[in-house]
């Protein structure tokens, strides 16, 4: 950056190199060039010469004043016009930054995605700070009183192998940057209560032509959690409002759920699950589309599958959702 140049003098910022956005600031430039009494001192911001609010303080020093500085980052340098020199002579440069102190982190959430081997902790960082802001996640065992700290710039994945202090912990987050420091409330967790089952996916749909046609949705998960509660939501693609059905599920078998839907309408389905009685849900699964037939039966699939867990037969769909390989997202 601009700070790596060889200086023939000194440049400094008041109140500081990193300051609160919207402040009035002064940038000072002092020349120390051999055999040069500067005729004029010039300031440049991001390579563009500044023309206003420059005050000469003495023979070697000048000040540039900015009112209500709102740029997150700027590179400043200053030059001198020396007698007998055709070009301006570089004095020095400095990168400056403006931003905000961190907000108090809130909505601290820690979950263990099944099979991940990690406890993932996230929080709402609040408003954008514009400057480098670090977070320290504190994890304190309620059984051993031992505390571990993890430094990060966003969320944190903590290996469950490193959580050796039993099952109950306090978690809190400290946010800090050059302009301030804040600390969240403490979250109390029990490791057994924060597991989110492996992603549920909808694999295919078929509409059976009966007196009242019915649509069967086939859905599945890799989870080995025994008691799982799930919700399936569905709506016509033209509608705004979702219908929701609830299920208590054991994924020993592929799940089959029946719906009585209007003919010749395109529907969209999603599913999500949680360990029964626990706090956190999976994010909703990818969108799965199925158009009900006018009269003839229709299958939204490329192959059929028996409904035993280890059948070995295959499933494919023509759903056009978006892929999320480890299914992280909203968990509230």
């Amino acid at each position: 950056g601009i700070t790596n140049i060889n200086c023939s003098g000194h440049i400094w910022v008041e109140p500081a190199t990193i300051f609160k956005m919207g402040m009035n600031i002064s940038i000072y430039c002092q020349a120390a060039i051999k055999n040069c009494q500067p005729r004029k001192l010039h300031f440049y911001k991001n390579g563009i010469k500044e023309r206003f609010q420059i005050t000469r303080i003495n023979k070697t020093t000048a000040r540039l004043w900015y009112k209500n500085f709102l740029e997150p980052h700027a590179s400043m340098y200053c030059t001198a016009e020396c007698p007998k020199h055709f070009q301006e002579t570089l004095i020095c440069g400095k990168d400056i930054s403006s931003g905000y102190p961190p907000d108090i982190p809130d909505e601290v959430t820690c979950v263990i995605y099944e099979y991940s081997g990690n406890m993932t902790c996230t929080w709402n960082a609040g408003k954008l700070t514009y400057i480098d802001t670090k977070y320290v996640v504190h994890v304190k065992s309620l059984e051993t009183e031992e505390e571990q700290q993890y430094l990060t710039s966003s969320y944190i994945n903590i290996s469950t192998d490193s959580l050796q202090g039993g099952k109950k912990y306090l978690v809190w987050v400290q946010a800090a940057n050059a302009l301030g420091m804040e600390e969240s409330k403490q979250l109390q967790i029990h490791l057994d209560d924060i597991v989110i089952p492996s992603a549920a996916v909808i694999s295919r749909a078929e509409t059976i032509n009966a007196t009242v046609p019915k649509t069967i949705i086939y859905w599945d998960s890799q989870t080995t959690i025994e008691k799982v509660s799930c919700e399936m939501r569905y709506k016509a693609t033209t509608n705004q409002t979702w219908n929701v059905k609830e299920f208590d599920t054991n994924f020993t078998y592929v799940q089959q759920s029946e719906f009585y839907l209007e003919p010749n309408i395109k529907y969209v389905f999603q599913v999500r699950c949680q360990e029964t009685g626990k706090r956190y849900w999976q994010p909703w699964s990818s969108l799965f589309f199925h158009k009900t037939p006018e009269t003839v039966p229709q299958v939204t699939s490329k192959a059929f599958q028996h409904d035993t867990w280890n059948s070995g037969l295959t499933v494919a769909s023509i759903s056009t959702g978006h892929l999320t390989s480890d299914n992280r997202g909203d968990i509230g």
Partner: nanobody
Framework: EVQLVESGGGLVQAGGSLRLSCAAS????????MYWFRQAHENQREWVAR???????TYADSVKDRFTISRDNAKNTVYLQMNSLKPGDTAVYYC???????????????RGQGTRVTVSS
């Protein structure tokens, strides 16, 4: 259509080793997570190991430091190296995979038929 075929099971003495393989074939655009599960009794499946597409691995506590999962993305194959086997490891071992069959579709779950591993004392 996607098939998963396991191989490498068999009878082994306690303390011995086996290497299981599971090859995926068919309409595959991309395989994300791949898993090994085992089932000693009906309706009692147990997760063994998981490997992500980037080869990050996690293991059940019961097999940690004894089993190693690996994969070859070019061959759409996942492996399970099982060392220091115990009679309690006796089960049918299944591989499963989160597969995208084309670039537009969400991933689907596919499962193999399983290969039997018997550990004698």
């Amino acid at each position: 259509e996607v098939q998963l075929v396991e191989s490498g099971g068999g009878l082994v003495q306690a303390g011995g080793s086996l290497r299981l393989s599971c090859a995926a074939s068919g309409s595959i655009f991309r395989i994300n997570n791949m898993y090994w599960f085992r089932q000693a009794h009906e309706n009692q499946r147990e997760w063994v190991a998981r490997i992500t597409r980037e080869s990050d691995t996690t293991y059940a506590d019961s097999v940690k430091d004894r089993f190693t999962i690996s994969r070859d993305n070019a061959k759409n194959t996942v492996y399970l190296q099982m060392n220091s086997l115990k009679p309690g490891d006796t089960a049918v071992y299944y591989c499963t995979a989160d597969v995208q069959t084309n670039s537009r579709d969400a991933q689907q779950i596919f499962r193999g038929q399983g290969t039997r591993v018997t550990v004698s004392s």
